[in-house]
Interface confidence: low
């Protein structure tokens, strides 16, 4: 019998390299059985995760899984950082692994840098 616990399928240490000025959708894959859980996004700030209250979000429903999406329209330099989604379900709080956005300012790079370049050229990152 399939478990009816809510599950959030963000992979551990997942990352996205994106350009400032582009639109971007950050997906939180959510699996649930009956009632849709209350899902929110937060951004990590040190040891706390600050809830993103006034950001546009949406649901994308697919056959076997749903995606709770955080919209960046457009991506801003200060969107750089780590994010986590969490679900409230039957009084339980389920938290995802964090996912990190590496934002490159288009004025600083003529082309999208690789992850290795990001690591070796931290000045490209806005923190």
């Amino acid at each position: 019998k399939e478990s009816c616990d809510v599950q959030l399928y963000i992979k551990r240490q997942s990352e996205h390299s994106i350009l400032a000025g582009d639109p971007f959708e950050l997906e939180c894959p959510v699996k649930y059985c009956a009632n849709r859980p209350h899902v929110t996004w937060c951004k990590l700030n040190g040891t706390t995760c600050v809830k993103l209250e006034d950001r546009q979000t949406s649901w994308k429903e697919e056959k076997n899984i749903s995606f709770f999406i955080l919209h960046f329209e457009p991506v801003l330099p200060n969107d750089n950082g780590s994010y986590r989604c969490s679900a409230n379900f039957q009084s339980n709080l389920i938290e995802s692994h964090s996912t990190t956005l590496y934002v490159t300012d288009v004025k600083s790079a003529s082309e999208r840098p690789s992850k290795d370049e990001m690591a070796s050229r931290p000045w490209l990152l806005y923190r």
């Epitope: 899902v39 209250e53 979000t57 949406s58």
Partner: antibody, heavy 120, light 108 residues
């Protein structure tokens, strides 16, 4: 200011297909969910279904077997097709935009509605 | 499907009076998944409240929403002539999205 305008025939014969289009002006159809809602004369509101600008859909199970909602981002339009109509499908049909908040949604912009009568 | 039940069906009040409209869900919809709409004859519904208590853009402060779980309330603190209309609640906790049957606020 976002505006929505429904268009389509006001009279459909029983067993035929009802086809309506909603044209969005004053804003892009992209990055939003769009919905159809209907209201039989003198009665309450019934949600029909929604479509995301990417084409992802979800329909009311009570109508699912008869509904198709599609989107044409190039024309800033989305459409409803309801097949095998009966007199019970006579209603004012509204298109609406979804406002997304936290993990829920409401309808913030509505068309003025179009009355569709099913009669032979 | 979550069934939304509104009461009373009709509320007869005078301008200046306080209106209290009730909406009950057949199962818990949390506090964040309830909206209220106003509809006048021949017009489309207008969003008043979402997330149970957040006023939509341009909605006067005399409209307020409260409640959680299965019981929600829309309060109009002092009825204005333009407030006489039908009011609907709507849940979006679970699909399909469902509306209540409406409460008509009429002039006494």
């Amino acid at each position: 200011q976002v505006q929505l305008q429904e268009s389509g025939p006001g009279l459909v014969k029983p067993s035929e297909t009802l086809s309506l289009t909603c044209t969005v002006s004053g804003g892009s159809i992209s990055s939003y969910y769009w919905s159809w809602i209907r209201q039989p004369p003198g009665k309450g509101l019934e949600w029909i279904g929604y479509i995301y600008y990417s084409g992802s859909t979800n329909y009311n199970p009570s109508l699912k077997s008869r509904i198709t909602i599609s989107v044409d981002t190039s024309k800033n339009q989305f459409s409803l097709k309801l097949s095998s109509v009966t007199a019970a499908d006579t209603a004012v049909y509204y298109c609406a935009r979804v406002i997304l908040y936290s993990s829920g949604w409401s309808f913030d912009y509505w068309g003025q509605g179009t009355l569709v009568t099913v009669s032979s | 499907e979550i069934v939304m039940t509104q009461s009373p069906a009709t509320l007869s009040l005078s301008p200046g009076e306080r209106a209290t409209l009730s909406c009950r869900a057949s199962q818990s919809v949390s506090s964040s998944y309830l909206s209220w709409y106003q509809q006048k004859p021949g017009q489309a519904p207008r969003l008043l409240i979402y997330g149970a208590s957040t006023r939509a853009t341009g909605i006067p402060a005399r409209f307020s929403g409260s409640g959680s779980g299965t019981d929600f309330t829309l309060t109009i603190s002092s009825l204005q002539p333009e407030d006489f209309a039908v009011y609907y609640c709507q849940q979006d906790y679970n699909l399909p999205l469902t509306f209540g049957g409406g409460t008509k606020v009429e002039i006494k």
